[in-house]
């Protein structure tokens, strides 16, 4: 029961996280005009990964896409790439994890296969979350650098009679969405990996074989040995993972020659 809960929760958390990563990637507010000195502005600028927008006090908003690929800063391209990789990995991870869910039965898929798929999706979620966090952090670093550069320009460029207002940009809502979403995806991935340990088959039910020692009538039943997957636990702790009674569908099948390859 605990395994199913952990796996299910991991899936849901990752799903929310990946939805957040997609939302952050599509959002226009990656950087927003700094309003520290002027909290109410007649023209408000904000920028995303794909377009920049201007909202006038009249309520009109105009957005322009970045219709160039080569003319964009390398850092912006890198952030785009990281976010897209994160989304793609996350989407594949979601697809894999759906089939890996313990509560979903697909044909005669065995627990070992589900364990492997859960681990795979978990790793994908972890990498996806890290990509998103990395992408957002790179963009944030870029903003901080540009912020202080433009601040320096504001105070050095006032020698003339006419002031030119330098627009400074600060963290937009998308950055916080991205960080949170990346974190959730990462946590979901870790939960899937933890759930994978409990999904690994508990024991291998080899048929008892009698060994007759000369002169004695003692039969040895090698029932205490398990096929090791690296995530196995002591058979005494079985109930921690399966929650006690099993349904008919959950009865473990006898191993075939294809198991534990």
């Amino acid at each position: 029961m605990a395994v199913t809960a952990c796996q299910g929760l991991g899936f849901v958390v990752s799903l929310i996280g990946i939805a957040g990563i997609i939302a952050a990637t599509c959002m226009d507010q990656w950087s927003t005009q700094d309003l520290y000195n002027n909290p109410v502005t007649a023209v408000f600028n904000y920028q995303g990964l794909w377009r920049s927008c201007v909202r006038e006090s009249s309520g009109f908003t105009e957005c322009r896409g970045y219709f160039t690929l080569l003319g964009l800063p390398a850092m912006l391209q890198a952030v785009r790439a990281l976010m897209i990789v994160g989304i793609v990995l996350g989407a594949i991870g979601l697809l894999v994890s759906i089939f890996a869910l313990k509560c979903i039965r697909i044909g005669s898929m065995e627990d070992s296969a589900k364990a492997n798929m859960t681990l795979t999706s978990g790793i994908m979620f972890i990498v996806s979350g890290l990509c998103a966090i990395a992408g957002v952090s790179v963009f944030a670093n870029m903003l901080v650098t540009n912020f202080w550069m433009s601040t320096a320009n504001m105070y050095t460029g006032m020698g003339g009679m006419v002031q030119t207002v330098q627009t400074r940009y600060t963290f937009g809502a998308a950055l916080f969405v991205g960080w949170v979403a990346g974190g959730l995806t990462l946590i979901g991935g870790v939960m899937m990996c933890i759930a994978c340990r409990g999904l690994a088959p508990e024991e291998t039910n080899y048929k008892a074989v009698s060994y007759h020692a000369s002169g004695h009538s003692v039969a040895y039943k090698p029932g205490g040995f398990k096929a090791s997957t690296g995530f196995g636990s002591n058979t005494k702790n079985k109930k921690i993972y399966d929650g006690g009674a099993r349904t008919e569908d959950e009865v473990q099948s006898y191993p075939s020659k294809h198991d534990y390859v």
Partner: antibody
Framework: EVQLVQSGAEVKKPGASVKVSCKAS????????VGWVRQAPGQGLEWIGN????????NYNQKFKDRATLTVDKSTSTAYMELSSLRSEDTAVYYC???????????WGQGTLVTVSS | DIVMTQSPDSLSVSLGERATINCKSS????????????LTWYQQKPGQPPKLLIY???TKQSGVPDRFSGSGSGTDFTLTISSLQAEDVAVYYC?????????FGQGTKVEIK
């Protein structure tokens, strides 16, 4: 046809308040901000403030912040500008306008003359 | 506050001649986000409310005759009437639409010589 129709001329005593109305028609009232601009006799234009009919959010010229109150009534598509503690220098024609692209005022009311005299 | 200064205060031009009005702002009204200058021009005839002519420094409002044009960037702007007509006699105002408070120039009176 877009129209902004303002209330009639007012004569007020110093220290009193005046409330000018502006009824909008010919467009979706909540889609455009309403601005207020005044013009003293023989003088230039002076911006008082803007109000959003959709959420009653306002932007004021600091000069009028304490004395001017901009409100809207969505049900009647009417904007109001109330100016308190009137002084003789507040004698002017008060215009309501519609705020459009480029933060420009594209349609104007006919104006309301407010005379402050003792 | 951005101070808008127009020149000249009044202008006498013969019919059919070119009229040029200048407007200077104390700060740049160029928005870096969309590279647009938030400067607006209005025409006010005696006894009438102002009429919008040009916004974003050079974009003509619909219905405005082609003889009106706006130019300039940053802090210096110009309104040009390529061929003055009798109906163009009015006071012309420039407006800062870039930052609060919105401010207007003192106006330029255009007359026929």
């Amino acid at each position: 046809e877009v129209q902004l129709v303002q209330s009639g001329a007012e004569v007020k005593k110093p220290g009193a308040s005046v409330k000018v109305s502006c009824k909008a028609s010919g467009y979706t009232f909540t889609s455009f901000w309403v601005g207020w601009v005044r013009q003293a006799p023989g003088q230039g234009l002076e911006w008082i403030g803007n109000v959003s009919p959709s959420d009653s959010y306002t932007n004021y010229n600091q000069k009028f912040k304490d004395r001017a109150t901009l409100t809207v009534d969505k049900s009647t598509s009417t904007a109001y500008m109330e100016l308190s503690s009137l002084r003789s220098e507040d004698t002017a024609v008060y215009y309501c306008t519609r705020l459009s692209s480029g933060n420009s005022f594209d349609y104007w009311g006919q104006g309301t003359l407010v005379t402050v005299s003792s | 506050d951005i101070v808008m200064t127009q020149s000249p205060d009044s202008l006498s031009v013969s019919l059919g001649e070119r009229a040029t009005i200048n407007c200077k702002s104390s700060q740049s009204v160029l928005n870096s986000g969309n590279q647009k200058n938030y400067l607006t021009w209005y025409q006010q005839k005696p006894g009438q409310p102002p009429k919008l002519l040009i916004y974003w420094s050079s974009t003509k409002q619909s219905g405005v005759p082609d003889r009106f044009s706006g130019s300039g960037s940053g802090t210096d702007f110009t309104l040009t009437i390529s061929s003055l007509q009798a109906e163009d006699v009015a006071v012309y105002y420039c407006q800062n639409a870039f930052s609060f408070p919105f401010t207007f120039g003192q106006g330029t009176k255009v007359e026929i010589k």
